[in-house]
Amino acid sequence: CDLPQTHSLSNRRTLMIMAQMGRISPFSCLKDRHDFGFPQEEFDGNQFQKAQAISVLHEMIQQTFNLFSTKDSSATWDETLLDKFYTELYQQLNDLEACMMQEVGVEDTPLMNVDSILTVRKYFQRITLYLTEKKYSPCAWEVVRAEIMRSFSLSANLQERLRRKE
């Protein structure tokens, strides 16, 4: 499955949409910075078979979709941009699912690394907890937007390594 060719353009568009989503100056939000404990090791791609790496990317995109699909999110961001954002995420999820199906039976290792999936879920739980504690304030959402943009950039690096593996 030649994932990056079908996927990386959508990833880039997702980043561009997120960059446009800002509603307030981030300079006013410096004191709201937070350590979400991004699971860097899950995106290094060294310990994964290809199918497992794809499942981690899928989980991250699914969790991002869930995070930005809440009513609190809809109340914060521009509706048109959110719709574009959902479309790109949905496209990426479809690409990854198609890839995972192609990987079935190709590798001896399991399709999913359960520990890695749980680590990604806990990361998003920390983000949701932060938003709750900050009462979904505009600055809290700005910090989360910056964090998700960073995680998407880092996941793009994993995709690039997968492409070179082929």
């Epitope: 960059a19 800002g22 100056s25 981030p26 300079f27 939000c29 410096l30 004191k31 709201d32 910075r33 937070h34 350590d35 979400f36 700005e142 910090v143 910056a146 964090e147 943009m149 960073r150 950039s153």
Partner: antibody, heavy 121, light 107 residues
Framework: EVQLVQSGAEVKKPGESLKISCKGS????????IGWVRQMPGKGLEWMGI????????AYSPSFQGQVTISADKSISTAYLQWSSLKASDTAMYYC??????????????WGQGTLVTVSS | DIQMTQSPSSLSASVGDRVTITCRAS??????LNWYQQKPGKAPKLLIY???SLQSGVPSRFSGSGSGTDFTLTISSLQPEDFATYYC?????????FGQGTKVEIK
């Protein structure tokens, strides 16, 4: 390799204008803010202001607001610091440095080599 | 603006000495404090960020501690290359502000 490369030393007369540059490479230029720091001869570090190259949003120290203008051209991964009318007191070394924005990451982890600006009649 | 006050302004020490520099903020900045080292004619170099995180590539003899208003940079065993000026900087809110610097000289 991450690098911030600044333009060369400048010698100017009072009242003249000047624009110095800071070119970023080895990283996604729009993913980090660029800050400017002044160091007058034999003195400490003073933060002047910062720019988000993704949308050119800026913030200035009150001490430098209206005295300088910070800008960026993301198409060439370059940030700028400019003066419309230099004073002798602007004589200093000027550094640019990258900042992770709202991300939990090291602040000002990479610095330019500095641009020495000398203003003298 | 948040004022940052370093002490001492300068100190003399010998190779192998334990050196401590303090930095006090005029209001609470949580853990949003960075430490930089600067040598003559060179750009500052980040040593410690978020009060206690060691920047990649910085020797482990450097450590940082503190939160709120009081912070400390410690060099556990001073080396010849450590003679320089050290600055603290708050990254809690704009305008960002630096301490006035502490010059570490050879005794």
């Amino acid at each position: 390799e991450v690098q911030l490369v600044q333009s060369g030393a400048e010698v100017k007369k009072p009242g003249e204008s000047l624009k110095i540059s800071c070119k970023g490479s080895g990283y996604s230029f729009t993913s980090y803010w660029i800050g400017w720091v002044r160091q007058m001869p034999g003195k400490g570090l003073e933060w002047m202001g910062i720019i988000d190259p993704s949308d050119s949003d800026t913030a200035y120290s009150p001490s430098f607001q209206g005295q300088v203008t910070i800008s960026a051209d993301k198409s060439i991964s370059t940030a700028y610091l400019q003066w419309s009318s230099l004073k002798a007191s602007d004589t200093a070394m000027y550094y640019c440095a990258r900042h992770p924005g709202l991300n939990w990451a090291p602040d000002f982890d990479y610095w330019g080599q500095g641009t020495l600006v000398t203003v003298s009649s | 603006d948040i004022q940052m006050t370093q002490s001492p302004s300068s100190l003399s020490a010998s190779v192998g000495d334990r050196v401590t520099i303090t930095c006090r903020a005029s209001q609470s900045i949580d853990g949003s404090l960075n430490w930089y080292q600067q040598k003559p004619g060179k750009a500052p170099k980040l040593l410690i960020y978020f009060a206690s995180s060691l920047q990649s590539g910085v020797p482990s003899r450097f450590s940082g501690s503190g939160s709120g208003t009081d912070f400390t940079l410690t060099i556990s065993s001073l080396q010849p290359e450590d003679f320089a000026t050290y600055y603290c900087q708050q990254s809690y809110d704009f305008p960002l502000t630096f301490g006035q610097g502490t010059k570490v000289e050879i005794k």
